[in-house]
C-alpha cells in the first residue's frame, strides 16, 4: 500500500503500512516523512540517504531495537526526529552523527537508562530534548551538556529519579543555560541535596506528582534553595497518587528561591488559608492556581504584590473578594461555584478575562464593577445573564470586549457602547441580542472588528446601524436570520475587508448594497437560500473583491434565471468551492454544479 | 461488528463496539463495574495513541431508548498544565492509566443506553478513536 501524499513532493504519511524497510519510491525532495507504526526494527547506516532534504522524521513505534553508526547520515537539514515508543537496545556511539541541524529530539519510552551514554553531545543545535517515560535513575547532567548551548527544553518526566545531588548540576554552573525549561514531574523524588540548585538559573521548572508525602515535599522544596527560576510549576495529576496531607509548611522553602511566576496545577486538597500557604509568594509577578478548591475566598484581598493572577478551573464557595492594588491582569476562567459576579477593587487592572464561569451580572458595566479606569481588555464570554445597565462609564480605555455566548439583556434600550471610542474589537455573537434600536453601535468610532453572528433583527431586516463604524475591517453577520437589508446599510464602511453574511435567509442576491465597500476582499453568502437575483440587472461587486462564497444556496436553474446564472459564471475567478454551488431546482437539475450548466434558452413568450 | 464486553453489575451490562474504520486496540476495565443507581470505582485504560493526546476532548452522543440527547463536548486536556498526566502522552507512547470516578443520586429508567464517544485530539484536530458503548439497564430496585 502506498504512502499518502499530503503535500506533493514535500509531505508523506506512511503510518502503519507494515513496511519492513524504508520506502525507496518517494521523491528526493521529501521534507516531512511519517513512518510511524511500521516494523522497521533495525536502522543501518545511511538508512535515509534517499531523503537529503528531510526536516521532520517520525519513527514512533517502529519496533526499532538497533540504530547503527550514521543511520541518519546525510540528513543535514533534519530539525525534528521522533523515536517515541521504540524498544532500543543498541544505540551506536555515532547513531546520531550527521544531524547538524537537529533542534528537537524525542526519545520518549525508548528504554533509555542513562543520559551519560546517550550519544548526543555533538548536537549543538539541539533546542528540545524529550526523554520522558524512560528508566533514567540519575539526574546527573553529563559533561557533554556544555556543548548543548541552545538547549531550551529538557523533559525528564516519568523517569526513576529519586535523588538530586550537588554534583548533578555542575555542568550548569560552568555554562548557565539561561533559557532552560526542565520538567521533572512524575519522578519518585525523596531527596534534593541542599545547595544542588544554588545559583542555578532556569526558565521553567515543573515538579508535579514527585512527592509521596508532605514531609518529602517539604524537604525537597527546601533543597531547591538558591534557585532562580522564571516560572515554577508545582502540583499533582488527578489520575496519579495524591498527597494525603497538605499544609502551609509544604511551601515554606520557597522563600529561599527567586521566582518570577508561580503556578499550582491540580491539588486534591481544600486550600483554606492561602495567606499563610503562599506567604513566600507574595511578591511573585504572576500567580496561578489551576484545578484547586479554595475555601476562604476573602483571602484574595490581602496585600499580595502580584501583577497577574490566574484562577482556572477552580472551585469556589462564592465569587472571591478581590482587592489587589498592583494587579494588572486577572484571568478567572472555567471556574465553578459563586455564580453571581460581585464587585472587585483592582485599581491597576488592564486585562480581565472572566470567561466560561456561568456568571450572571446584575448590572454591566462601569468602573465601579471592576474598581479600575485602566481596563483595556475585557472578556465576559460564555457566561450567564448579563444585564446592561450602564454604558461603560469610566471604562473608556477599553480596546477589546468579548461577550460571545453570554445572554445579554437590555441591549436595545440605550447606546450601550457610547463611551467606547477606543474599542477596536467587539464580539457579541450568540448573545440573544435582538437589534431593535439603530443607535446600538453609536460611539464605536475606532472599531475594526465586529462579530455579531447568531443574533436577530426586528423583522429580520438589517437597518442602518453601522453609520459610525468608519474604521471597520471585519464584520460577521452570519446566522442572524436576516432576510432583507437596507440598501444603505454598509455605505459608511469604506474600510471593510471581510463581510460574512452566511447562514442567513436571503432568497435573492443583490450587489447594490455593496457599492461603497471599496476595500472589500471577502464576501461570504454561503448557506443562504438564494434562488435568483433581485429584479434589477446585477452590477459588479467592488473591484477589490477577491473571494465570493455562494456555496450551499438554492439556485433555481431554469431559463427565467438565465441572466443571473450567466452573471455567476462571469464571477468565476472570485468564486470559492465552486463544486458546492449546485442547482436546487428543477428536479432534473438538482445537484448539478451551477458552473457546468449549459443553459440555452429559447425564451418563447 | 465485533462487540467487546466490559463488565456486568447488579443493574447494568456494559459493552462497546468500534465506530471508526481504524479500530486501534484499546483496553478498558472498570472495577467494580458501574451500577447506575450509585457508583464509585476505577477506570483502567491501556492504549497506544496514533497521535498526541494534547488538547484531547470527547464528543458524546447519548441515546436513551432511541431518544437522542443533545451532543455533549467534554474537554479533557486543555493544552498546558492539565489535570491528567496522560494529556502529555505522545503518539506511540503507552498510556496505562487509572482514573477514579464516582456519581450518586441519579435515577435511570430501565432500558438500553447508547453512548458514542468520539475522541478528538491534536492540532489540527483529528479523531483519535470512536467507541459506541451500550449499557443495558435492568433496575433491580425501585
Amino acid at each position: 500500500e502506498p504512502c499518502v501524499e499530503v503535500v506533493p513532493n514535500i509531505t508523506y504519511q506512511c503510518m502503519e503500512l507494515n513496511f519492513y524497510k524504508i520506502p525507496d519510491n518517494l521523491p528526493f525532495s521529501t521534507k516531512n516523512l511519517d513512518l510511524s507504526f511500521n516494523p522497521l526494527r533495525h536502522l543501518g547506516s545511511y538508512s535515509f540517504f534517499s531523503f537529503p532534504e528531510l526536516q521532520v522524521l517520525d519513527l514512533s513505534r517502529c519496533e526499532i531495537q538497533t540504530i547503527e553508526d550514521g543511520a541518519y547520515q546525510s540528513l543535514s537539514h533534519l530539525s525534528t526526529l521522533i523515536l517515541t515508543g521504540n524498544p532500543i537496545q543498541s544505540l551506536a556511539l555515532g547513531a546520531f552523527s550527521g544531524l547538524s541541524s537537529l533542534q528537537k529530539l524525542v526519545a520518549v519510552e525508548t528504554n533509555l537508562a542513562s543520559l551519560e551514554n546517550f550519544p548526543i553531545g555533538h548536537l549543538k543545535t539541539l533546542k528540545e530534548l524529550n526523554v520522558a517515560h524512560n528508566l533514567i535513575q540519575s539526574f546527573k547532567l553529563p559533561e557533554y551538556f556544555s556543548n548543548l548551548t541552545n538547549l531550551e527544553h529538557l523533559d525528564l518526566s516519568s523517569n526513576k529519579i529519586q535523588s538530586i545531588y550537588c554534583t548533578d548540576l555542575r555542568v550548569l554552573h560552568q555554562m548557565p543555560l539561561l533559557n532552560l525549561s526542565l520538567d521533572l514531574s512524575l519522578n519518585p523524588m525523596n531527596f534534593i541535596q541542599p545547595g544542588a540548585f544554588k545559583e542555578i538559573r532556569l526558565h521553567k521548572l515543573t515538579l508535579r506528582n514527585n512527592f509521596d508525602s508532605l514531609n518529602v515535599m517539604k524537604t525537597c522544596i527546601q533543597g531547591l534553595a538558591g534557585l532562580e527560576v522564571h516560572r515554577l510549576v508545582l502540583g499533582e495529576f488527578r489520575n496519579e497518587g495524591n498527597l494525603e496531607k497538605f499544609d502551609k509548611s509544604a511551601l515554606e522553602g520557597l522563600c529561599n528561591l527567586t521566582i518570577e511566576e508561580f503556578r499550582l496545577a491540580y491539588l486534591d486538597y481544600y486550600l483554606d488559608d492561602i495567606i499563610d500557604l503562599f506567604n513566600c509568594l507574595t511578591n511573585v509577578s504572576s500567580f496561578s492556581l489551576v484545578s484547586v478548591t479554595i475555601e476562604r475566598v476573602k483571602d484574595f484581598s490581602y496585600n499580595f504584590g502580584w501583577q497577574h493572577l490566574e484562577l482556572v478551573n477552580c472551585k469556589f464557595g462564592q465569587f472571591p473578594t478581590l482587592k489587589l492594588k498592583s494587579l494588572k491582569r486577572l484571568t478567572f476562567t472555567s471556574n465553578k461555584g459563586g455564580n453571581a459576579f460581585s464587585e472587585v477593587d483592582l485599581p491597576s487592572l488592564e486585562f480581565l478575562d472572566l470567561s466560561r464561569n456561568g456568571l450572571s451580572f446584575k448590572g454591566c458595566c462601569s468602573q465601579s464593577d471592576f474598581g479600575t479606569t485602566s481596563l483595556k481588555y475585557l472578556d465576559l464570554s460564555f457566561n450567564g445573564v448579563i444585564t446592561m445597565s450602564s454604558n461603560f462609564l469610566g471604562l473608556e480605555q477599553l480596546e477589546h470586549l468579548d461577550f460571545q455566548h453570554s445572554n445579554l439583556k437590555q441591549m436595545s434600550e440605550f447606546s450601550v457602547f457610547l463611551s467606547l471610542r477606543n474599542l477596536i474589537y467587539l464580539d457579541i455573537s450568540h448573545t440573544h441580542t435582538r437589534v431593535a434600536f439603530n443607535g446600538i453601535f453609536n460611539g464605536l468610532s475606532s472599531l475594526e472588528v465586529l462579530k455579531m453572528a447568531g443574533n436577530s433583527f426586528q423583522e429580520n431586516f438589517l437597518p442602518d446601524i453601522f453609520t459610525e463604524l468608519r474604521n471597520l475591517t471585519f464584520l460577521d453577520l452570519s446566522q442572524c436570520q436576516l432576510e432583507q437589508l437596507s440598501p444603505t446599510a454598509f455605505n459608511s464602511l469604506s474600510s471593510l475587508q471581510v463581510l460574512n453574511m452566511s447562514h442567513n435567509n436571503f432568497f435573492s442576491l443583490d450587489t447594490f448594497p455593496y457599492k461603497c465597500l471599496n476595500s472589500l476582499q471577502v464576501l461570504d453568502y454561503s448557506l443562504n437560500h438564494i434562488m435568483t437575483s433581485k429584479k434589477q440587472e446585477l452590477q459588479h461587486f467592488p473591484s477589490s473583491l477577491a473571494f465570493l462564497n455562494l456555496t450551499q444556496n438554492d439556485f433555481a436553474c431554469t431559463c427565467e434565471h438565465q441572466s443571473f446564472l450567466q452573471w455567476i459564471k462571469d464571477q468565476r475567478q472570485l468564486l470559492v468551492e465552486v463544486e458546492r454551488m449546485e442547482c436546487a431546482t428543477p428536479s432534473d437539475k438538482q445537484g448539478m454544479p451551477v458552473l457546468s450548466l449549459n443553459i440555452t434558452c429559447q425564451m418563447n413568450k | 461488528q465485533k462487540q467487546y464486553w466490559v463488565c456486568n453489575s447488579s443493574d447494568a451490562s456494559i459493552s462497546y463496539t468500534y465506530c471508526d474504520k481504524m479500530q486501534y486496540p484499546i483496553s478498558i476495565n472498570v472495577n467494580p463495574c458501574i451500577e447506575l443507581k450509585r457508583s464509585k470505582g476505577l477506570l483502567h485504560i491501556f492504549y497506544i495513541p496514533r497521535r498526541d493526546l494534547k488538547q484531547l476532548y470527547f464528543n458524546l452522543y447519548i441515546t436513551v431508548n432511541t431518544m437522542n440527547l443533545p451532543k455533549r463536548k467534554e474537554v479533557i486536556c486543555r493544552g498546558s498544565d492539565d489535570d491528567y498526566s496522560f494529556c502529555r502522552a505522545l503518539k506511540g507512547e503507552t498510556v496505562n492509566t487509572t482514573i477514579s470516578f464516582s456519581f450518586k443520586g441519579i435515577k435511570f429508567s430501565k432500558g438500553k443506553y447508547k453512548c458514542v464517544v468520539e475522541a478528538i485530539s491534536g492540532s489540527p484536530e483529528e479523531m483519535l478513536f470512536c467507541l459506541e458503548f451500550v449499557i443495558l439497564h435492568q433496575p433491580n430496585s425501585n
Partner: nanobody, 119 residues
Framework: EVQLVESGGGLVQAGGSLRLSCVAS????????MGWFRQAPGKERDIVAR????????YYAESVRGRFTISRDNAKNTMYLQMNNLRPEDTAVYYC????????????WGQGTQVTVSS
C-alpha cells in the same frame, strides 16, 4: 416527524381561482421557510413560490408572478397559495414543501394535490 398535508386542489375553468392549503404537524414550522412546487405531466418538478418563516420574504416563479400569492398563518401552522386567473398550463400536482432544521432546504414534502385547469 414532520407531516405536510395539502388540500384545496380540484378542477377549475381557465380564469378561475383556487386556494391551496398546507397544514404542518409534528413540529412547529414557524421559523422555517415553506413553499409550493408543482409537477405537470411529463415535466420536471419545479418551484412555484416560497415564503420565509416571518413572511418578510417571498419568491415567485416568473410564470405565476402577479397571479399567485403565497401566505402563511404560523399560529395555525398552515401555508396557503391563492391562485387567480388560472391557465391550462397551471395544471399539475402541487406539493407543499418545508425546510428542515439548520436551514436544510426542501427537507419535508407533502403527498401533493391535483389542480386541473380546463380551457
Amino acid at each position: 416527524e414532520v407531516q405536510l398535508v395539502e388540500s384545496g386542489g380540484g378542477l377549475v375553468q381557465a380564469g378561475g381561482s383556487l386556494r391551496l392549503s398546507c397544514v404542518a404537524s409534528g413540529r412547529t414550522l414557524s421559523t422555517y421557510n415553506m413553499g409550493w412546487f408543482r409537477q405537470a405531466p411529463g415535466k420536471e418538478r419545479d418551484i412555484v413560490a416560497r415564503i420565509s418563516g416571518s413572511s418578510v420574504s417571498t419568491y415567485y416563479a416568473e410564470s405565476v408572478r402577479g397571479r399567485f400569492t403565497i401566505s402563511r398563518d404560523n399560529a395555525k401552522n398552515t401555508m396557503y397559495l391563492q391562485m387567480n386567473n388560472l391557465r391550462p398550463e397551471d395544471t399539475a400536482v402541487y406539493y407543499c414543501v418545508a425546510d428542515g432544521p439548520g436551514g436544510r432546504s426542501y427537507e419535508y414534502w407533502g403527498q401533493g394535490t391535483q389542480v386541473t385547469v380546463s380551457s
